[in-house]
């Protein structure tokens, strides 16, 4: 397992949300990929290929998300100061072997500023 | 050709309840969430209820938690909806609805193909 | 809950005409934001997906546009088809709601 610092942009603010951008190498064909606040998984997506290289995209919960080649990205809205913690990216490669988990993570600061859209 | 097809509605008393199943065709069901959506006679649309793939998150729209139940049975590409305690203000054409995965969204509620609807009348 | 207000109820047009319906949000809604066709006695027809994503199959006389909680669906050249009522709906926090619907009536 590493454990580390996104070495990226993770968090973009946008009318009163953030998405938390989770990257993987773009060689990753099957996966699971958790989002973590603190200890709590909040969200998670799951590609795997079937039979005939059918894809499978599959969610444990209602949490908006977004697949690339080579991230996912997870919405999170109607942010308050609750939200201020740390956001870990939780990686399990299954394809191509060996399995591995990757951890990656920052911290979500929340200012005033960011939660200026959901006064409207 | 996906394939959404209600059945179960009827008249019902006030009180009493009613079980409205959907069957799906066409794709692969148990990759995504459902949900029921209702009409009003002569009204806007309302969502109802949602429930991912495998039944680990389920939500409802205040006004019938307590009283509906979601559920799904893979096996059978069916989605069903209990409705006890039914009132007046129930009567609806129910949809059933497939949560749509265009452009690489997982998880937001919009909804691509729906069925037909099957009329449920709450009268005494 | 979000409210969805969308003007004008009806609208009268003729074929060939540019209507434009608008959405609000009473709330900031980012772009999560898919419209709907109903036409009499039918099921509801996918349009539009995050504010301004046109739906596969669906023709590009149709567009979206709009992010925050002012949204709005253009129907660049009216079509006898195009004839129906039209909903807005927020997926942003739940629970997800519906506009009241804008119906498009031949004039």
């Known amino acids: 397992e590493i454990n580390g610092s996104a070495n990226y942009e993770m968090f973009i603010f946008h009318n009163g949300g953030v998405q938390i951008l989770c990257k993987y190498p773009d060689i990753v064909q099957q996966f699971k990929m958790q989002l973590l606040k603190g200890g709590q998984i909040l969200c998670d997506l799951t590609k795997t290929k079937g039979s005939g290289n059918t894809v499978s995209i599959k969610s444990l919960k209602f949490c908006h998300s977004q697949l690339s080649n080579n991230s996912v990205s997870f919405f999170l809205y109607n942010l308050d100061h609750s939200h201020a913690n740390y956001y870990f990216c939780n990686l399990s490669i299954f394809d191509p072997p060996p399995f591995k988990v990757t951890l990656t993570g920052g911290y979500l600061h929340i200012y005033e500023s960011q939660l200026c859209c959901q006064l409207k | 050709e996906v394939l959404l097809v209600e059945s179960g509605g009827g008249l019902v008393q006030p009180g009493r309840s009613l079980r409205l199943s959907c069957e799906a065709s066409g794709f692969t069901f148990d990759d995504y969430a459902m949900h029921w959506v209702r009409q009003a006679p002569g009204k806007g649309l309302e969502w109802v209820s949602g429930?991912?793939?495998?039944?680990?998150?389920?939500d409802y729209t205040d006004s019938v938690k307590g009283r509906f139940t979601i559920s799904r049975d893979n096996a059978k590409n069916s989605l069903y909806l209990q409705m006890n305690s039914l009132r007046a203000e129930d009567t609806a054409l129910y949809y059933c609805?497939?949560?749509?995965?265009?452009?690489?969204?997982?998880?937001?509620?919009?909804?691509?193909?729906w069925g037909q609807g099957t009329l449920v009348t709450v009268s005494s | 809950d979000i409210q969805m207000t969308q003007s004008p109820s009806s609208v009268s047009a003729s074929v060939g005409d540019r209507v434009t319906i608008t959405c609000r949000a009473s709330q900031g809604i980012s772009s999560w934001l898919a419209w709907y066709q109903q036409k009499p006695g039918k099921a509801p027809k996918f349009l539009i997906y995050a504010a301004s994503s046109l739906q596969s199959g669906v023709p590009s006389r149709f567009s979206g546009s709009g992010s925050g909680t002012d949204f709005t669906l253009t129907i660049s050249s009216l079509q006898p088809e195009d004839f129906a009522t039209y909903y807005c709906?927020?997926?942003?926090?739940?629970?997800?709601?519906f506009g009241q619907g804008t119906k498009v009536e031949i004039k």
């Open positions: 429930i991912t793939w495998n039944s680990g998150s389920i």
């Open positions: 709906q927020q997926a942003n926090s739940f629970p997800w709601t």
């Open positions: 609805a497939k949560e749509s995965t265009s452009g690489s969204y997982y998880n937001v509620p919009w909804f691509d193909y």
